[in-house]
């Protein structure tokens, strides 16, 4: 892979010196480094009207390196790019730009959304939920005996949480009234609902669920702030009820 010099041979600057600073193999007073020691990258830095050669162990931000047989050279990425694979393909954009297919954009194209952590344009992800689980046994105040009219609940899982612009999740709990033949509670029988039905409450902000309306079946679009307020109100209600030592099945 030896370099075969073309018609335009590069002429050395008249003031070429061998006593060079940090990493330079050859240098001149006027242009700085002209060539580098092995494994170092040669980069031209513009200082005013002058271009100064510098030798570095790796290319600086906004440059990419090419290891030619006779020289390791840094080449500038496009102006809006911080890290690039080559002139055509950016891999990390400068602040304020979003990366999409190797290009840096002010805004993400239609159908994509900006990920403000990675600063990339990503596909919009919509909520996905599982099928409904079977209805729970008919209960009243947490008991399965000693009443005629109670409520039953069914749940479904969130399979895919939505991204910022994705469709919100529909309700994951549904409660309805139920009627059973009254059955006397046996002595000491509390008849509480099975523990396996208890679901861990999602962490704050973990699931983007829409709160159902009074029918408990339709989802409504709402802002994160509204959702946060409702969750706080719900927590307070639950705490109040716990103080009154009444266990009720609620709609999430």
């Amino acid at each position: 892979q030896n370099a075969s010099r073309g018609r335009r041979q590069r002429r050395m600057h008249p003031n070429v010196s061998q006593g060079c600073q940090g990493g330079c193999a050859t240098c001149s007073d006027y242009n700085g480094c002209l060539s580098c020691k092995p494994r170092l990258f040669f980069v031209l830095e513009r200082i005013g009207m002058k271009q100064i050669g510098v030798c570095l162990s790796s290319c600086p931000s906004g440059y990419y390196g090419t290891r030619y047989p006779d020289i390791n050279k840094c080449t500038k990425c496009k102006a809006d790019c911080d890290t690039c694979f080559n002139k055509n393909f950016c891999t990390k954009c400068k602040s304020g730009f979003y990366l999409h297919l190797g290009k840096c954009l002010d805004n993400c194209p239609e159908g994509l959304e900006a990920n403000n952590h990675t600063m990339e344009c990503v596909n919009i992800v919509h909520c996905e939920v599982s099928e409904w689980n079977p209805w729970s046994p008919c209960t009243k105040k947490g008991k399965t005996c000693g009443f005629k009219r109670g409520t039953e609940t069914r749940v479904r899982e969130i399979m895919q949480h939505p991204s910022a612009k994705g469709n919100l999740c529909p309700p994951t709990n549904e409660t309805r009234k139920c009627t059973v033949q009254r059955k006397k509670c046996q002595k000491g029988e509390r008849g509480k609902k099975g523990r396996e039905r208890k679901r861990k409450k999602p962490n704050k902000g973990e699931s983007k669920e829409a709160i159902p309306d009074s029918k408990g079946l339709e989802s409504s679009k709402e802002t994160p702030e509204q959702r946060e307020n409702k969750q706080q109100q719900k927590k307070r209600k639950v705490q109040d009820k716990q103080q009154k030592s009444v266990s009720v099945s609620t709609v999430h």
């Epitope: 010099r5 073309g6 290891r67 393909f89």
Partner: antibody, heavy 116, light 107 residues
Framework: EVQLVESGGGLVQPGRSLKLSCAAS????????MAWVRQAPKKGLEWVAT????????YFGDSVRGRFTVSRDNTKSTLYLQMDSLRSEDTATYYC?????????WGQGVMVTVSS | DIQMTQSPASLSASLGETVSIECLVS??????FVWYQQKSGKSPQLLIY???RLQDGVPSRFSGSGSGTRFSLRISGMQPEDEAEYFC?????????FGAGTKLELK
Amino acid sequence: EVQLVESGGGLVQPGRSLKLSCAASGFTFSDYDMAWVRQAPKKGLEWVATIIYDGSRAYFGDSVRGRFTVSRDNTKSTLYLQMDSLRSEDTATYYCTAHDRSFDYWGQGVMVTVSS
Amino acid sequence: DIQMTQSPASLSASLGETVSIECLVSEDISNDFVWYQQKSGKSPQLLIYAASRLQDGVPSRFSGSGSGTRFSLRISGMQPEDEAEYFCQQSYKYPPTFGAGTKLELK
């Protein structure tokens, strides 16, 4: 739209010469290192030569060094490959490509057959 | 020169099947790695650069992974238009070297 169009291929006898040309359009030719990559019939890809953006340096694969020369005319956005002392093993489709670490743009290729 | 060992040499897959092609490199090249697709009678086209980044227009069923000396190309759900030869290339240093290629056919 980027276009690279090769020409100058054909049938040539061993030991003879051939010059390939590649006309480029749709991108800033003078910004890019340009290369020739070849592919023998039913075989893989082999890098032949690269000339840097300003034409001042060129690099060659072991199998062609000393026999092939590469040049460019940035005013005409054209790349050339001068092939001398051709051998039967030089028989291949020759592709003109923009070489910037990866080979980003490719021409349609031109067939060179070296046979007596 | 950096050696590229690509496997398998050929592969046939059914429609919708997931396929993987691997490339082993003789020295650590970080992620300076590229995949090309060459359809029959056509010139190669850049598919993936920097080991895992898709070129514009490449369907999302294609994905690249790996770093250092081991790289792979995955097609999640083979389509008729994916029938082609695939080549890997190291872009770490001169001379640029290619894998021998993998011919992917539709069963």
